[in-house]
């Protein structure tokens, strides 16, 4: 089941997605698409990165975080009700059957009739944790090549913590944008 994120009409929506680069600047291609993740690639691509840079984007869709450090969270500017739906973040790890796929559900709420002014806040301090990788299986002798490891269990966990925390719920209700360090 998809993790659900909310935004109000007219605001910016934030859909989190992260990975751990093997080394700074050692990037993995990522695509964002509208619709659930298909077998390969992303359907209805709205943004794509390669090993160096963002190489494709469409209006209103951008990466606000430092994608060179693995923060490939998508920001959708000035959302409308039509932006509701499932979005796919796909970390395209080289080799077959390696891609990490996240389906995120965006729910757009109509704007309040008299919206109270809200101040955008940065919640780095509220969530001061690093995404670290955990071992897979038994200890191994291994040579690290130029390839990248992502532990998506932890990313999901962080996303769920954000989603489930009272602070996040309070923020969502107030319409503030949630940002992760």
């Amino acid at each position: 089941s998809e993790v659900e994120y909310r935004a109000e009409v007219g605001q910016n929506a934030y859909l989190p997605c992260f990975y751990t680069p093997a080394a700074p600047g050692n990037l993995v291609p990522v695509c964002w698409g509208k619709g659930a993740c298909p077998v390969f690639e992303c359907g209805n691509v709205v943004l794509r990165t390669d090993e160096r840079d963002v190489n494709y984007w469409t209006s209103r869709y951008w990466l606000n975080g430092d994608f060179r450090k693995g923060d490939v969270s998508l920001t959708i500017e000035n959302v409308t009700l039509a932006d509701s739906g499932i979005y796919c973040c796909r970390i395209q790890i080289p080799g077959i059957m390696n891609d990490e796929k996240f389906n995120l559900k965006l729910v757009i709420k109509p704007a309040k009739v008299t919206p109270a002014p809200t101040r955008q806040r940065d919640f780095t301090a509220a969530f001061p944790r690093m995404l670290t990788t955990r071992g897979h299986g038994p200890a191994e002798t291994q040579t690290l090549g130029s390839l990248p490891d992502i532990n998506l269990t932890q990313i999901s966990t962080l996303a769920n913590e954000l989603r489930d925390s009272r602070l996040a719920n309070d923020l969502r209700d107030s319409g503030a944008t949630i940002r992760i360090g």
Epitope: G95, N98, H136, T143, D149, I150, T153
Partner: antibody
């Protein structure tokens, strides 16, 4: 301890279908691809396909599309492979194997645990 | 599909000798190559992954090397228990295997 326990030997008639099982234990079944591999007597290994129980993603090699059908039951941590329209060339040992995939930091992509194999004999 | 060609088909060795098994890929597969040992009437077991990484518990007499299209498995001092078939496989694209090399004593 990771274990893959496969169903017992099968004897089938040409044209029939058979369903092989592979029960996984000792790890999170939904977090790893389960692969199926064929080995005919005295021959090499041939990849059939794979299923990712977490989201139901399935891949087949061209040679086994229409021949093999892969499914998984998350509640019992069991993967299944059904082989249809059996012929003598389907006689082989069939293995299930867990796949350790690469991540953004470590290159893996290997079959790390294998079942004991199920021998299928197709004969009239 | 990527073809994996193993040579030789079989080889006869004496205990203590150095053994070199070869595997060639029909196209560049980077270092996405693994080696598996299969003893008679047993399932395959992983020896080497990523072309040169020894898997957990594998004796250090087994060494893998190579990249792109040419790969080698070396057993520095073969033991009686190494009697087995050895399979190379690539996993850059959908997995394919060589036909195996039978090591006989």
């Amino acid at each position: 301890e990771v274990q893959l326990q496969q169903s017992g030997a099968e004897l089938a008639r040409p044209g029939a279908s058979v369903k092989l099982s592979c029960k996984a234990s000792g790890y999170t079944f939904t977090s790893y691809w389960m692969q199926w591999v064929k080995q005919r007597p005295g021959q090499g290994l041939e990849w059939i396909g794979a299923i990712y129980p977490g989201d139901g993603d399935i891949r087949y090699t061209q040679n086994f599309k229409g021949k093999a059908t892969l499914t998984a039951d998350k509640s019992s941590s069991t993967a299944y492979m059904q082989l249809s329209s059996l012929a003598s060339e389907d006689s082989a040992v069939y293995y299930c194997a867990r796949w350790e995939k690469s991540t953004t930091v470590v290159q893996r992509n290997y079959f790390d645990y294998w079942g004991q194999g199920t021998t299928l004999t197709v004969s009239s | 599909d990527v073809q994996m060609i193993q040579s030789p088909k079989s080889m006869s060795m004496s205990v203590g000798e150095r053994v070199t098994l070869s595997c060639k890929a029909s196209e560049n597969v980077g270092t996405f190559v693994s080696w598996y040992q299969q003893k008679p009437d047993q399932s395959p077991k992983l020896l080497i992954y990523g072309a040169s990484n020894r898997y957990t518990g594998v004796p250090d007499r087994f060494t893998g090397s190579g990249s792109a299209t040419d790969f080698t498995l070396t057993i520095s001092s073969v033991q009686a228990e190494d009697l087995a078939d050895y399979h190379c496989g690539q996993s850059y694209s959908y997995p394919t295997f060589g036909s195996g090399t039978k090591l006989e004593m």
